[in-house]
């Protein structure tokens, strides 16, 4: 997260972080007792490693109560996800058995109604990603509010060119933006989740080119069917 | 296949107003922005303004300011031009193009302003 | 406004050749270029975005280069439908700018 701060512990309970062998390598948002939500290309850059999720954390090294790592039973990436673009950049990460809830870990409940959120809509991004250009990760969680821009400015040439469909959303990127290791995070509005961070290779805190996040409301039935 | 259909040809007389419309299809009209840009006879290209379909936010050559209106109707993906006060220089193809992704362009409309 | 200067404003070619329009802006506009092509009662058609991206469908002849206030349109090998008039625009900074065209005839 870039221009942001530390995020007051443990105070969004549903966040994840999608580990390999042991590092964090994307964020994730719990949806499910059993189920997390992330970005479809961050099993990309798993390779052959083992996959975990980390519930329950505010700081990624240091022992906390309600930190617990769950091994993945079942990744199911969205099956139009391909390497080569960020369409239905989704990932759904079965955990083997369910979370232990508590006041750290709790599902957050995810925007259904098929409908764009209003631009200039506030809305919070958290994760463990980078904090400055230089690529410096943080230990401890952060987090951004960051206002939604509507997509025919996200679209435009000096933006991402045409390349936002209607089952993306943008959000403005003016210093304060999400960047690598947030990817599969949540972008949450109003206390709803409404995107999920894309892992592209997006340069970040640029103006002109907009956080990309993906609309899980445009997902609702391949959510439903996968956690079903 | 993305549409760009415009309306016919006008001709008017000097100190009328004219209205240009331009037909999206083929993708979502809300999604990008449309700039209009005129080409009068023998000459190059010049850009009027453009409108965000979304907010109805309109961004002006400062030439055409006083004269340019820009309006959407999303209901039937249509964009406007108006151009008041017409003069014999105002006599041009008129373009509405999409702005962002491929080049669409419409097909232009020849507006004839003579006395 | 940013000026867009292009040149030349005509030029006489065979097929085969290999042909540069070169266009100077009159302040940087990064790499907020594109090219257009446009023949006579046709709407222009759009060649290259972002200074050297070429548009689907544009043969690979086509090349662009650039950035800051230096740009250039290449046709490595000028074929007959090629003959037309060629514009540049800036799009980075209000009101968008074209060049004054340069118009590529038959020798």
């Known amino acids: 997260i870039l221009g942001g701060r530390e995020a007051e512990a443990h105070a969004r309970p549903y966040m994840a972080s999608v580990q390999v062998n042991g590092e964090h390598l994307c964020g994730g948002v719990l949806v499910a007792e059993q189920w997390v939500l992330s970005a479809a290309h961050c099993l990309e850059d798993a390779a052959d490693g083992k996959v975990q999720v980390l519930l329950g954390a505010h700081s990624l090294s240091q022992p906390e109560p309600s930190k617990r790592l769950y091994d993945v039973l079942r990744a199911v990436p969205h099956p139009d996800s391909r390497p080569d673009t960020i369409d239905h950049d989704l990932l759904l990460l079965q955990l083997s058995e369910k979370a232990t809830l508590g006041p750290a870990v709790r599902p957050l409940p995810w925007q259904r109604v098929d409908r764009d959120v209003e631009p200039g809509t506030l809305c919070d991004v958290a994760g463990w990603g980078i904090v400055s250009h230089a690529g410096r990760r943080p230990d401890r969680l952060q987090h951004v509010l960051l206002p939604v821009l509507d997509r025919a400015t996200c679209n435009r040439r000096t933006h991402h060119d045409g390349a936002i469909t209607q089952r993306m959303m943008c959000a403005e990127s003016n210093r304060r933006d999400s960047c690598k290791g947030d990817s599969g995070g949540p972008l949450v509005c109003g206390g709803v989740l409404e995107g999920v961070v894309t892992s592209g290779s997006r340069v970040c805190g640029n103006r002109k080119k907009p956080g990309i996040y993906t609309r899980v409301a445009s997902y609702a039935a391949w959510i439903d069917s996968v956690l079903a | 296949e993305v549409q760009l259909v415009q309306s016919g040809a006008e001709v008017k007389k000097p100190g009328a107003s004219v209205k240009v419309s331009c037909k999206a299809s083929?993708?979502?009209?809300?999604?990008?922005?449309m700039y209009w840009v005129r080409q009068a006879p023998g000459q190059g290209l010049e850009w009027i303004g453009e409108i965000n379909p979304t907010s109805g936010e309109t961004n002006f050559n400062e030439k055409f300011k006083s004269r340019a209106t820009l309006t959407v109707d999303t209901s039937t993906s249509t964009a406007y031009l108006e151009l008041s006060s017409l003069r014999s220089e105002d006599t041009a193809v008129y373009y509405c193009?999409?702005?962002?992704?491929?080049?669409?362009w419409g097909q232009g409309t020849l507006v004839t302003v003579s006395s | 406004d940013i000026q867009m200067t292009q040149s030349p404003s005509s030029l006489s070619a065979s097929v085969g050749d290999r042909v540069t329009i070169t266009c100077k802006a009159s302040?940087?506009?990064?790499?907020?270029v594109a090219w257009f092509q446009q023949k006579p009662g046709k709407a222009p058609k759009g060649l290259i975005r972002s200074a050297s991206s070429r548009y689907s469908g544009v043969p690979s002849r086509f090349s662009g280069s650039g950035s800051g206030t230096d740009f250039t349109l290449t046709i490595s090998s000028l074929q007959p439908e090629d003959f037309a008039t060629y514009y540049c625009q800036q799009y980075n900074n209000y009101p968008l700018t074209f060049g004054q065209g340069t118009k590529v005839e038959i020798k």
């Open positions: 083929g993708y979502t009209f809300t999604s990008y922005y």
């Open positions: 302040q940087n506009v990064d790499t907020d």
């Open positions: 193009a999409r702005e962002g992704g491929f080049a669409y």
